[in-house]
Structures are given as structure tokens and as C-alpha cells.
């Protein structure tokens, strides 16, 4: 299946050129997407090319500048947020990144009615998180780990919490592990639908062991970065959820929401909070051994001013074959009756599907079914449910958007996207306005990405929001590689793969092969998306074949494949990459003396283990920021898949699955090990231990560290990294420079 059908081919071969590394590093062929910033059922905001914030009304066709670039520039604003009453805008500047999602910033409030910044009772700086209430213009913000409330932007703040302390107590924002591995947000506070209540999490990290690493900077002495970071088996954060009435915050103060008894009996996590109405909230909890999740629906008791979570409104989700959920436990989408909800979880055949829960999980009505998976519920209206799945034509690496009519019986299903731009677009996401009056579709490929606006009732396309015309024109004289997505059937396992082939690929010739691997639980690498990246360059210019393979442990193909790796990470993921390589060799166009593997993060772990598998298949390989032992990685992530590193649980496999245990096996491969010294996520410790084991085994290897760089190796380090890896691979494959 050739996946670049939208490319316009220039018949004059001599005007075509191959991709260069410089093209990739400069982002020459990057694409744009258009996600409307919805502010109503028919209006959205968008930042224009000249940085004006423009309001568009789809129904009336009106558009106008709500905030000028001049105002934005006056405070060097890089972001904005309109209050729901449209009286104020917050302007965000001095962005300072912390971890994956978190950052601090300075906030200014601009009054749209008089065209001036609000003076008096200005916000402190830097703020860790700030947001408007869903209606009106109340503000909640987090400063120095405490939560504050303003009834109006110019009012003095009301302090909600007082116990916040750096690295100890976090209010309204997550600590490191909750941010990275559980919430996947920078915030841990949630307004009720009409802004009456504010719910927030408090994380107590007092007893959590601290990871410390040097940040070299420019000073005479390096700084030490300290992060409370629970590694596998270590003491975890203690979480509590509180709710405060924002109309009369001083009246009774924050009220704690009770934890379900079956959860509170041992270590547990809070996983998400969903407001249903102003006086009903849904909390999800998870046992530390992450195969039991409890969804608890709580109601406000006016008489006691407390939150009541009756046992009859507790819904248990349990996995007997793996962990609960996919990567995360799914969140509920409530229907209009404010008690029943839709949720994705495994059906009896082990495929993740949408279920409708009215009273108990046992009596759930299955809404979708089949040997494919429902992936995301976008929106539920009174008569429709919009979701994405990989059902169409049985390609797990595709995403199409479907509408199920829930207002009629039996419910009818319609694929909204399957036939829109079939060759160009097979991987969609969507963004819905209030009540799904309109929606934007963002197609990521396999052709050049395109974003379109649609009517929520008829699904009619209204207009193209972004079609990447400049990119399309720029690619007209580029010899892009060919891509195909196919599958291998091996011992009752289906291994989907993506192969990236040189432009003048000839099956009768032999090519060097590079395997790019991630392979982490519930991940997916083989996707029908557009990309012009480093591996595109390696195929286009350097004549390599690149392959990506989704083996056991990967997502969206059923629980059998997903949960195969449960409690034994580092075994089947590696086996399946090796199996695929053997199959590729059988295809006849791979030079079996020139095969390499590379990966980043979990992929660095898999590539290291593959190189040390003793198969003799790989000549060389690269591991960027690899995990080397699961005892070094975060508790929430690691224990989800591995259990605890204790004798009576799974310590043996923790020990057996390290990279260090296989140090001897690196003797016959060329190994390049790369890591940032300021990696807060996969600590430099991981690579330090690999290096130590290799030195102790007297095994030669190559290494590169990036001083003061985190897990992303961004900025100039990116250029250096890819240049360095290119040289390494070209040397390995005996390709001339």
C-alpha cells in the first residue's frame, strides 16, 4: 500500500532532489494543523498569521479582532484566554517550562470593555496555573503550591489553601509522577459546570524519596535539582480531593471527598475527576496494584454542606488478564440524565469498546463491538455520540470518526470520515463546539494533513481551515520515500509494520535496514500519518530501508496482544522485533550484514535488549535516553505493567529484565548510548549504569551525553544528536559521507 497518494509527481526526474538532513533539522517540511479555540456552539477564536486574536462566528459569517497584536506585544504575550463572559482576557508571558506539561508564567488581565489592563490587585508572579471559571469571570490560580480565588479580576484574592510547600505539598497542581504518569496535565483543579464549586487535589510528597541530579549551568558550582520521584516500589504521594463553594468560600471551607472503602484499604491513586452537574461529581480511583479501578459518583448534601458518595454509585472496573484500562483508565462521558454514562473498557472478547452504564457495570449495554477498538469518545449530545476507532478496513493504525445516533432505536452508526478524502486521509482527530453544533476534523495523513470545518447536524464540510498548500508545493520537487503498511502473521500473532523505502526502490537489490522501535505498553508506531522526518531522510538520501513494527504489548488490537507483556516487560517486545527482522530478510531485498536498530526512551530499552539478544542479526544500534532497569523508573508507570519489585511479587523479573544483565552480549555489536544529564523522566542514572556494566565487562561502546538536557534533547542538542546518529549509522552501513 503506497501511502503518499496525494503527492504530485514531477515528470522531469532531473528537477527532483532527495531530502537532506538540513531539511529535517530546519523543519522545512513541517505541516500545520488548525484547531479552533471554541468559545460557543458557533464561535471560535484563532490567532491570525499577524498575531491578532480573531473571533469567527460560523452562523453569521462575522469575524473581527477581539484582541490586537499590539496588545499582545505590549506584554510579550505568547498565549491568551478569554473569560466566558467575554469581559476579560488573560495574557500569558514569561513562559518557563518545568516538566512535560507544567510551566510557570506571568499573567496580565486585559479588560475588553475599556481596552485597558486591570490595575490593582495584580496577580503575583510566577503563577503555576491559572484558569477562568466556566461562566462569568472568576479566576482560580496556583501560586507557590497554594490555590487562590478571585471573584472578579480586579478583586483581592481569597486564599483557599495554606499548606502548600515546594516539593512537599502540592495544591491544585500535580507532583512529578502524577503529572507524567496519571493526569497528563499541568493542573489538578476542576471547576463545576457553572462555576459554583471548585474541586482540587492535594498531593503530599513529604515521604517520597528524592532524585537529585546536577544542573551545570554557567556558574562556578553546579546546582542540584531535587524532585520527589517515587521509583518502583518506593513510597508514593498521598492524595486527597477537596471541593470548595466559590460563591461563599469562607463559609464552610474546603470539604474533603471520601475515598471508596475498597480503595482506601491499601495504597491507591486518584486518576481523574469529571463534573456531571454543579452538585454531582465523579471521581476515579485506582489501587496501587493497578488492576482495580473504582468510579465513584458523589452528590452535594445541601443540609450538611458535604459530599456524599453512596456505595450504590460506585462502579468497579477490574482486569483479570492485565492492568485496568489501556494506557490510562478511560474517563466517563455522562449523558443528559446526569447519572448514566458512556465509557470505553474491554468487552468479553478482550477488545476495548464503548459501553453505556445506567445502573451497574455488570448491566452495561455494549454500544460498539468487533475485532477492532473504540479509541476515544469525543462528544455525547442528546441524539448522537461521536467517537473514533480503527474499525475501517481492519487497519489498526488508522483513525476514523463515527457518529452513533442514540436518539433512535436501534442506534444507527455512520462513519463521518471514512470516505471524505480516502487516499489522503486515514488518521483523524476532531474538535467539537458546544453541543456539537460544528466540528473541525484534523487529518494527519497519510497524505499531507488537512483541517476542515463541518456542520454538526449534517456533517457537511463548510470550509477548509488549513490545507498546507505551501508544503504541498515545496514537496513537488522532493524525492520522498515510498511507504507501505502491511502485516506479518507469525504464530497466531499479527505484526503490523510500516516500511519506508528509498524513492527508486528495486526489489532485486539489497538495502541496509534500520529498525525504529518504541514498543512500550499501549503504544502504537505503525500509524497512517504523514511525516517528513529523520527516517524519511535516511530512506530518501542514504538509501536505507526503515521499518517500524508493532509487536506484543502495543495497543488497539485487543487485550491478547496488549496484555501479553504484563509482568514481563523486555521479553516479547524484543522477540517480536527480531521475528520481524527475520521476515524482512526473507523478503529478499535486505542486506543482512547491514541491519541496525534504534529507539528512544522505552525504544532505547528495547533496542538495547535487541542488540544484546545474541542473535547476531544486528550490526549496530543506538539507544537514546533508555530505561535500563525497571527499578529506576517511576512507580505509577512501572508497577502498572510489572507489579512490585518485591520477593513475593515480581522482583525476579525486575532483575532479569535489566540491560546491565546482558552487558556481555554487546561485545559483537556497535552500540551508541546517548542521554541528557538533566533528564527528569528517565534519569541519567539508567545510562550511567549501562556504561558502568559495559566497562566492567570490558565491552567497547560509543556514548554521547547532552549536558543540562532533559528527556526531549531539544534545541541545538537535537541538531547535534541527529547529525551524530547519522554519522554513526553511515559508518555502520559503510555509506560514504
Amino acid at each position: 500500500i503506497v501511502l503518499r497518494p496525494s503527492r504530485v509527481h514531477n515528470s522531469e526526474e532531473n528537477t527532483m532532489r532527495a531530502l537532506t538532513l538540513k531539511d529535517i533539522l530546519n523543519g522545512t517540511f513541517s505541516y500545520k494543523t488548525f484547531f479552533p479555540n471554541w468559545i460557543s456552539g458557533q464561535e471560535y477564536l484563532h490567532q491570525s498569521a499577524d498575531n491578532n486574536i480573531v473571533l469567527y462566528n460560523i452562523e453569521t459569517g462575522q469575524s473581527y479582532t477581539i484582541l490586537s497584536n499590539r496588545t499582545m506585544k505590549s506584554v510579550n504575550a505568547s498565549n491568551y484566554g478569554l473569560s466566558p463572559d467575554r469581559q476579560f482576557v488573560y495574557l500569558e508571558s514569561d513562559y518557563s517550562k518545568l516538566w512535560r506539561y507544567s510551566y510557570t508564567a506571568t499573567y496580565y488581565i486585559y479588560d475588553l470593555s475599556n481596552g485597558e489592563f486591570v490595575r490593582g490587585n495584580e496577580l503575583p508572579r510566577p503563577i503555576q496555573y491559572l484558569c477562568w471559571s466556566p461562566v462569568g469571570s472568576k479566576l482560580a490560580y496556583v501560586y507557590q503550591n497554594n490555590i487562590y480565588l478571585k471573584q472578579r479580576p480586579g478583586d483581592p484574592p481569597f486564599q483557599i489553601t495554606f499548606n502548600g510547600r515546594e516539593n512537599k505539598i502540592f495544591n491544585g497542581i500535580p507532583d512529578w509522577v502524577y503529572e507524567e504518569e496519571m493526569l497528563a496535565t499541568k493542573y489538578a483543579l476542576w471547576w463545576s459546570p457553572n462555576g459554583k464549586f471548585l474541586a482540587y487535589a492535594e498531593f503530599n510528597d513529604t515521604d517520597i524519596p528524592v532524585i537529585a541530579y546536577s544542573y551545570y549551568g554557567d556558574e562556578q558550582y553546579p546546582r542540584t535539582i531535587n524532585i520527589p520521584y517515587p521509583k518502583a516500589g518506593a513510597k508514593n504521594p498521598v492524595v486527597r480531593i477537596f471541593i470548595i463553594d466559590t460563591t461563599y468560600p469562607a463559609y464552610v471551607g474546603p470539604q474533603e471527598v471520601p475515598v471508596p472503602a475498597m480503595i482506601a484499604s491499601s495504597d491507591y491513586y486518584f486518576s481523574w475527576l469529571t463534573w456531571v452537574t454543579d452538585e454531582r461529581v465523579c471521581l476515579q480511583w485506582l489501587k496501587r496494584v493497578q488492576n482495580v479501578s473504582v468510579l465513584s459518583i458523589c452528590d452535594f448534601r445541601e443540609d450538611w454542606q458535604t459530599w456524599d458518595c453512596p456505595k450504590t454509585q460506585e462502579h468497579i472496573e477490574e482486569s483479570r488478564t492485565g492492568w485496568a484500562g489501556g494506557f490510562f483508565v478511560s474517563t466517563p462521558v455522562f449523558s443528559y440524565d446526569a447519572i448514566s454514562y458512556y465509557k470505553i473498557f474491554s468487552d468479553k472478547d478482550g477488545y476495548k469498546h464503548i459501553h453505556y452504564i445506567k445502573d451497574t457495570v455488570e448491566n452495561a449495554i455494549q454500544i460498539t463491538s468487533g475485532k477492532w477498538e473504540a479509541i476515544n469518545i469525543f462528544r455525547v449530545t442528546q441524539d448522537s455520540l461521536f467517537y473514533s476507532s480503527n474499525e475501517f478496513e481492519e487497519y489498526p493504525g488508522r483513525r476514523n470518526i463515527y457518529r452513533i445516533s442514540i436518539g433512535s432505536y436501534p442506534p444507527s452508526k455512520k462513519c463521518v470520515t471514512c470516505h471524505l478524502r480516502k487516499e489522503r486521509c486515514q488518521y483523524y482527530t476532531a474538535s467539537f463546539s458546544d453541543y456539537a453544533k460544528y466540528y473541525a476534523l484534523v487529518c494527519y495523513g497519510p497524505g499531507i494533513p488537512i483541517s476542515t470545518l463541518h456542520d454538526g447536524r449534517t456533517d457537511q464540510e463548510i470550509k477548509i481551515l488549513e490545507e498546507n498548500k505551501e508544503l504541498e508545493n515545496a514537496l513537488k520537487n522532493i524525492q520522498l520515500p515510498k511507504e507501505e503498511i502491511k502485516k506479518l502473521e507469525v504464530d497466531e500473532i499479527t505484526l503490523w509494520y510500516k516500511m519506508i523505502l528509498p524513492p527508486q526502490f528495486d526489489r532485486s537489490k539489497k538495502y541496509p535496514l534500520l529498525i525504529q522501535v518504541y514498543g512500550g505498553p499501549c503504544s502504537q508506531s505503525v500509524r497512517s500519518v504523514f511525516a517528513v522526518n529523520w527516517i524519511s531522510y535516511l530512506a530518501s538520501k542514504e538509501g536505507m530501508v526503515i521499518a517500524l513494527v508493532d509487536g506484543r504489548g502495543t495497543a488497539f488490537q485487543g487485550d491478547k496482544l496488549l496484555y501479553a507483556v504484563y509482568r514481563k516487560l523486555g521479553v516479547y517486545e524484543v522477540e517480536d522485533q527480531i521475528t520481524a527482522v527475520r521476515k524482512f530478510i526473507e523478503m529478499g531485498f535486505i542486506d543482512e550484514k547491514r541491519i541496525a536498530i534504534w529507539g528512544w526512551s522505552y525504544g532505547g530499552y528495547v533496542s538495547s535488549l535487541a542488540l544484546a539478544s545474541g542473535t547476531g542479526l544486528f550490526k549496530c544500534g543506538i539507544a537514546v535516553a533508555p530505561v535500563s532497569s525497571w527499578e529506576y523508573y517511576a512507580s505509577v508507570y512501572t508497577e502498572r505493567f510489572m507489579g512490585l519489585p518485591t520477593k513475593d511479587d515480581n522482583l525476579e523479573h525486575y532483575k532479569n529484565s535489566t540491560v546491565m544483565a546482558r552487558a556481555e552480549y554487546f561485545r559483537n555489536v556497535d552500540y551508541l548510548l546517548i542521554h541528557g544529564t538533566a533528564d527528569d523522566n528517565v534519569h541519567f542514572q539508567n545510562s550511567a549504569q549501562i556504561a558502568k556494566a559495559l566497562v566492567n565487562a570490558q565491552v567497547d561502546f560509543q556514548a554521547m551525553w547532552y549536558s543540562d538536557q532533559n528527556h526531549g534533547l531539544s534545541g541545538l542538542s537535537t541538531n547535534h544528536l541527529y547529525t551524530h546518529m547519522t554519522h554513526f549509522l553511515k559508518q555502520c552501513f559503510s555509506l560514504s559521507d
Epitope: 479582532t65 466566558p84 463572559d85 470593555s113 466556566p134 462569568g136 457553572n194
Partner: antibody, heavy 123, light 107 residues
Framework: QLQLQESGPGLVKPSETLSLTCTVS??????????WAWIRQPPGKGLEFIGN???????YYNPSLKSRVTISVDTSKNQFSLKLSSVTAADTAVYYC???????????????WGQGTLVTVSS | DIQMTQSPSSLSASVGDRVTITCRAS??????LNWYQQKPGKAPKLLIY???SLQSGVPSRFSGSGSGTDFTLTISSLQPEDFATYYC?????????FGQGTKVEIK
């Protein structure tokens, strides 16, 4: 406190053009938060939305009147105006200018109204 | 356009009575509904917005309820100053449309 005041002739002949102006005081018409609207009410009948305008001049007209309506804005005078062409007796009404306030998610209500001006179409 | 239908079109009541006016939308408008009171020769005055939120300064005897297509304005104990015409208005879809009005008269 925001105030709106309609002005214009109270009598217009059939087939001519009705012209009204709304003067805004106590606030700026250049406020980018809101639209400015015209609404009318025939004697003894209900209210009908005519159209709106933003400070930038961007307009929307009720489809039922679209072919005959023009709304314009003059930010220097803090005014916006209505022109309704080819009037008939059916256009006899009290004409109000109004401004909404927003609650959330685009949910708005008309919080500010002029006192209204009666325009009679008669020869 | 969304049609707004009020009932009754008029009603007679006494001071102290509980009065209920209903408004039906031709399609679902969620809670995008407002209620106004209009006295002769005056502009409409906002009472209730977003179906159930009481506008500041409006007496608490006025209340609103409903969602989707059916809405109610209730005056718990009618006062002499409440004799007027009441209009509902939707802001869910453009153009905004009003009900034809309900006239509350003295019995």
C-alpha cells in the same frame, strides 16, 4: 453605567428609507467583547431581532430582512446606525438598540436596551 | 430560525397567586434561554438568563427552570408591580428569537 439612546424621525413615508442612530454613553462602542443590535416591536406584537454589528463593522442581518437592512458603526462618535429601505406599513414598530452580556459558552442575553423609538410608516 | 412558543398568551391572576408561564423551542436550545419583563411604553427588562439564573436586582419570587425544549418562568407570589408582558428569548442559534409574549393581567 452603560446607556443607549435611539434617535431619528418618527414618521417615514412608504417606499422610503428608515434611518435611526443609537448613541452609546457610559462605555465604548469599540469594546471588542460585544455586538450592538437593533430589535423592533410592532404595536401590540412581539420582539424581532433585526441585526447586529461589531466595532470593526462586521455585520449580521436577520435573513427575513437582509435585503433591506444596513447597519453601520461610527466609533469616533460612539454611535451605530440602522437603515431599512423600501419600508411599508408593516415596518411600523418601536425600534430598540441593545447590547448583550455573555454568561458562558456563548450564552448571551440583552442586558442593555435603549428606551425605544416609535417609527410610523405612513404617507 | 428557531421558533419560540409561549403559553398561555395571556392570563388573569390575583396578587399573591403563583403564576407559571411556559416557553417551548422548536428544537433543543440547551439552557440558552432568557426571560424578560416588559411594561407598556418601556424597554424589556431581563429577569432570568441561562434558563435559571436570576439577574442581579430581580426579586427572588421569580425563578426559571427547564432545559432542551421546554422552559418555565414561575412567579411564586404575584405582586402588583408584576403585571406586565413576559417574553422568552433563545440565544442558542442565530438569529436570536423571542416568544410572542404572555400578558399577565389583574383578575
Amino acid at each position: 453605567q452603560l446607556q443607549l439612546q435611539e434617535s431619528g424621525p418618527g414618521l417615514v413615508k412608504p417606499s422610503e428609507t428608515l434611518s435611526l442612530t443609537c448613541t452609546v454613553s457610559g462605555g465604548s462602542i469599540s469594546s471588542s467583547s460585544y455586538f450592538w443590535a437593533w430589535i423592533r416591536q410592532p404595536p401590540g406584537k412581539g420582539l424581532e431581532f433585526i441585526g447586529n454589528i461589531y466595532y470593526s463593522g462586521s455585520t449580521y442581518y436577520n435573513p427575513s430582512l437582509k435585503s433591506r437592512v444596513t447597519i453601520s458603526v461610527d466609533t469616533s462618535k460612539n454611535q451605530f446606525s440602522l437603515k431599512l429601505s423600501s419600508v411599508t406599513a408593516a415596518d411600523t414598530a418601536v425600534y430598540y438598540c441593545a447590547r448583550p452580556s455573555y454568561y458562558g459558552s456563548g450564552n448571551y442575553y440583552f442586558a442593555f436596551w435603549g428606551q425605544g423609538t416609535l417609527v410610523t410608516v405612513s404617507s | 430560525d428557531i421558533q419560540m412558543t409561549q403559553s398561555p398568551s395571556s392570563l388573569s391572576a390575583s396578587v399573591g397567586d403563583r403564576v407559571t408561564i411556559t416557553c417551548r423551542a422548536s428544537q433543543s436550545i440547551s439552557s440558552y434561554l432568557n426571560w424578560y419583563q416588559q411594561k407598556p411604553g418601556k424597554a424589556p427588562k431581563l429577569l432570568i438568563y441561562a434558563a435559571s439564573s436570576l439577574q442581579s436586582g430581580v426579586p427572588s419570587r421569580f425563578s426559571g427552570s427547564g432545559s432542551g425544549t421546554d422552559f418555565t418562568l414561575t412567579i411564586s407570589s404575584l405582586q402588583p408591580e408584576d403585571f406586565a408582558t413576559y417574553y422568552c428569548q433563545q440565544s442558542y442559534s442565530t438569529p436570536p428569537t423571542f416568544g410572542q409574549g404572555t400578558k399577565v393581567e389583574i383578575k
